[in-house]
């Protein structure tokens, strides 16, 4: 094949090599950029900056090599459009530093920076950590800081990410209240800070105020949906990023729902309870307090992390006719109480009914939780005719 006369020549099925001296000063308009997985650049003294726009359209890029060139600056967001990048070789350039943000979000298996006049500062603390933790092949490079000795020996006691403290109201927050949160940011070289409010949706009207080092956030006219939602303050400096999440507890009264009994491996009277703080629960059977035992007890499903409502069952193991009757769930918290009742009929008397027999009643539960249970059966037996009546 004839030698390629262009600045950049194809290499394999999806590679490009740009090695003609001084032919590039940027990476705009590389041929076949959309499908490139490998880009090799060498001897490009005029290529001094690598920025976001340079790699736009290189979404498939896996390997990027820029060596023996004039690279002095790589923008923190330079690789935003190349999320699949796994090997990055920037050796023998003029780089004095490289932001932690540049490699954030990438899964780099290899990062080569040897042969650069690195300047030891807190901005390279992340790279020192990579060296300590054996990441990206960095330890093998024994990186040096220009005139300062090994990167590994750089003092780092003062190199910390920002420290955040979020102040939330001590007092109880009620539905409709306005809540002021304040985020105090401390640390050296603070660059940016802000709030992440993606979970809030319709939970409140949001107003931001202030700036570094003290950020304010007003949540106006809060709803009960604000419970269990994260409000996150973040801040960045040249060392890295810090986040602190808090939750605002919005008080609201207990509520309860009961549903028709269903037969599974055992019987279940399904319920849902809500309220903040979490309500205490009590069951009544035919108007008397139901004492929970291994045959009749409350179990909860795993709670969803971002909501206050709890779902569960009053679980009945092999109930008989004596368990037929009216079940009431009482839920109470300091802001109110609620109850719901349902009639359940599990079976007719399978033991021959005698009108003179006492009708036993299980007479104070703690609310309870969980999974699994009966012995593995050798055969399935259909229970006696079952009817369920809803009160």
């Amino acid at each position: 094949a004839a030698p390629c006369p262009d600045a950049c020549c194809p290499h394999g099925s999806s590679g490009l090599r740009c090695t003609r001296d001084g032919a590039l000063d940027s990476l705009h308009h590389l041929p076949g950029a959309e499908n490139l997985t490998e880009l090799y650049i060498e001897n490009q003294q005029h290529l001094q900056h690598l920025e976001l726009r340079d790699l736009r359209g290189l979404g498939e890029l896996r390997n990027l090599t820029i060596v023996k060139s004039g690279l002095r600056f790589v923008a923190p967001d330079a690789f935003h459009f190349t999320p699949r990048l796994s090997r990055l070789n920037l050796s023998f350039n003029a780089l004095e530093s490289l932001s932690w943000k540049t490699v954030q979000g990438l899964s780099l298996q290899e990062l080569v920076l040897s042969g650069n006049p690195l300047h030891c500062s807190c901005a390279l603390r992340w790279l020192q950590r990579w060296e300590e933790e054996g990441l990206g092949g960095v330890p093998e490079q024994k990186l040096q800081c220009h005139g300062q000795g090994p990167l590994a020996h750089m003092p780092n006691a003062s190199c910390g990410v920002p420290t955040l403290k979020v102040q939330v109201p001590n007092a109880s927050v009620d539905v409709g209240d306005d809540v002021l949160l304040r985020c105090q940011v401390e640390g050296r070289g603070l660059e940016q800070a802000g709030w992440i409010l993606t979970e809030l949706e319709q939970s409140a009207t949001v107003m931001k105020s202030g700036g570094l080092p003290s950020l304010g956030l007003t949540l106006a006219n809060v709803t009960s949906d604000l419970n269990r939602k994260n409000v996150t303050c973040w801040a960045e400096n040249d060392v890295g990023r810090a986040e602190v999440s808090v939750q605002v507890n919005v008080s609201f009264p207990a509520s309860v729902q009961l549903h028709t009994a269903v037969e599974m491996h055992h019987w279940c009277i399904p319920f849902s309870v809500d309220g903040q703080p979490a309500p205490s629960l009590r069951w009544l059977f035919n108007g008397s307090v139901l004492n929970e035992t291994s045959f009749i007890f409350t179990e909860f499903l795993e709670p969803a992390a971002n909501e206050t409502v709890r779902h569960g069952c009053l679980r009945l193991n092999q109930p008989t006719h004596v368990n037929n009757g009216n079940y009431t769930l009482l839920a109470a918290n300091p802001f109110g109480q609620a109850s719901a009742s349902i009639m359940a009929a599990f079976m007719d008397n399978p033991f021959e009914f005698n009108p003179e027999d006492p009708i036993p009643v299980s007479f104070s539960p703690v609310d309870t939780n969980s999974t699994s249970g009966d012995p593995v059966e050798k055969k399935d037996e259909t229970p006696f005719g079952v009817s369920v009546a809803v009160g």
Partner: antibody, heavy 115, light 108 residues
Framework: EVQLQESGPGLVKPSGTLSLTCAVS?????????WTWVRQPPGKGLEWIGE???????NYNPSLKSRVTISVDKSKNQFSLKLSSVTAADTAVYYC????????WGQGTLVTVSS | SSELTQDPAVSVALGQTVRITCQGL??????ASWYQQKPGQAPVLVIY???KRPSGIPDRFSGSSSGNTASLTITGAQAEDEADYYC???????????FGGGTKLTVL
Amino acid sequence: EVQLQESGPGLVKPSGTLSLTCAVSGGSISSSNWWTWVRQPPGKGLEWIGEIYHRGNRNYNPSLKSRVTISVDKSKNQFSLKLSSVTAADTAVYYCARAPWFDYWGQGTLVTVSS
Amino acid sequence: SSELTQDPAVSVALGQTVRITCQGLSLRSYYASWYQQKPGQAPVLVIYGKNKRPSGIPDRFSGSSSGNTASLTITGAQAEDEADYYCNSQASSGNHLIFGGGTKLTVL
């Protein structure tokens, strides 16, 4: 498969406190099961002592209630029995089991009350 | 009363059918469970609930209930069925459990 293993002193002095632990393996003590203690004096029948749920609910045999405490340690996946003011009549093999059906049992541990 | 009564001893010829009974007021309200215990071993659950057998229990074991009596029936008794058999159920109050005194089964 769930396995249960009792442990504790085999000899307790009269008027002392009998303490046993049941380690649960092959399953979580925080599942939808209760956990129970049963005892069997030498040459005699089985006697139910009490039961506990991981959330703290417990029930005891009325005849032993004043002397019995059953507790659960979720972090260690085990539950325990304490029986106070013991006499020779409390000498028995003590079993732990899974309630309500007692479908899994420990192998039992003999506790002798004697001075 | 919180009691379950069993016959102290029952015998059966090899291969024949035997019924072991358990009587008590609470059995009008609750199912009985049945346990087999061999010397020096922990009890083994053989029947629970409404005639339910755990995995591994032969189908010659069955349970039934009528009035205040629960029964364990072994159809075609085997030599290995020789053991003590205990019933249990919830007490009439529903708040605790009770065991019968046990029945020693001899297979002849």
